[in-house]
Interface confidence: low
Amino acid sequence: MEDFNMESDSFEDFWKGEDLSNYSYSSTLPPFLLDAAPCEPESLEINKYFVVIIYALVFLLSLLGNSLVMLVILYSRVGRSVTDVYLLNLALADLLFALTLPIWAASKVNGWIFGTFLCKVVSLLKEVNFYSGILLLACISVDRYLAIVHATRTLTQKRYLVKFICLSIWGLSLLLALPVLLFRRTVYSSNVSPACYEDMGNNTANWRMLLRILPQSFGFIVPLLIMLFCYGFTLRTLFKAHMGQKHRAMRVIFAVVLIFLLCWLPYNLVLLADTLMRTQVIQETCERRNHIDRALDATEILGILHSCLNPLIYAFIGQKFRHGLLKILAIHGLISKDSLPKDSRPSFVGSSSGHTSTTL
């Protein structure tokens, strides 16, 4: 059997519905049909059960961890800082996303058997989680920047403003995730499991490029630059002023940001490489195509893993979270009140002192 690869748009259009009279029947096959074997997506059957186990673990950890985080923040009404409000929203986003993981896990094994409605909803939750996550972290970085570099409590004092910012973040995340809601559907293919996939008609490739570049720019690169700017100046101020306590107070936030970057930067870099390849900036080969597909699968797992990591950061680095959790357990008589630390305060990760709101 001879195999040929076809990449020409005009020839593809012809097969998809153009009139045969436009073509010369005696002409030879286009050269691009003769020089390469078809580029088949590599089957990753071996990995799918490993992925399901990862998804199941992340689901359980995320459900437990983020529920506890939300519980602790909601309990500590008195000393709740601005950062706490952002972290509460972050936990909510992760929790909502975690609830979709069993569906994603099942789809890895059986293909997308849940229909178009769930395809749209579940994909939307995944996208909203990602965008709200990075936008909330950008807001935390701005809050830390204002509190430490400019020693201002403007945002801290205006609670309604924080609520408005959080609502705006959710709104903007929904907006950035809108393409998924509009164009995702269940795609049925013969001999292949159905997939939850973008379907934009004949201009699928062009639309997808535009609808990928826009969210990638506004939803990842812009917030990333804001974070780098804010934390750059915040660190400089802390080191210059030798503010030891406040430096310690930044550990949780830096850990949260670092973990976010470690989890989502690889995926976005691979996505960027794929974008460049599809726009012919990088030359496309079958090997590269399969490498990028494999890298997308692998780095996506990292991104999914992120939804359960923030609670672990608070538990291991955030002293106030541990104290808050112990306090809740003591209130409900699950542990003795004597075991509570003496300096245990109601705030989850923060306490306001002077003109700054420090986060632990």
Epitope: M6, E12, L33, P38, S190, A205
Partner: nanobody, 123 residues
């Protein structure tokens, strides 16, 4: 592995009929079109007929009214019914399929060809 298996070729008298069939198997994704090309040794390959996923078909002018193309979507099979055969229809007939596979963000557009089946029309 994706395979295209043709059958039905052979030797036939002028004015006679033959039915070629071609079955596509393997991990193929969705089939956008299946069709037939033919090639006389030493000459260029020419398109005979195409059947697209939407149900539309097209036949080359040289065989119009004599050849018909049909498809069994359930079996991923395409047929070429050749009636009123002429000696000039003698050629190797190649089955062709254009498919799309989905993976991540990408649509893989692939083309597959059969080994070819010899059709000889004697006068």
């Amino acid at each position: 592995e994706v395979k295209l298996v043709e059958s039905g070729g052979g030797l036939v008298q002028a004015g006679g009929s033959l039915r070629l069939s071609c079955a596509l198997s393997g991990r193929i994704g969705s089939i956008n079109a299946m069709g037939w090309y033919r090639q006389v040794s030493g000459q260029q390959r020419e398109l005979v007929a195409v059947s697209r996923s939407g149900g539309s078909t097209d036949i080359a002018d040289s065989v119009k009214g004599r050849f018909t193309i049909s498809r069994d979507n359930g079996k991923n099979t395409v047929y070429l019914q050749m009636d009123s055969l002429k000696p000039e229809d003698t050629a190797v007939y190649y089955c062709y399929a254009h498919t799309s596979s989905y993976s991540n963000w990408r649509v893989y557009n692939n083309d597959y060809w059969g080994q070819g089946t010899q059709v000889t029309v004697s006068s």
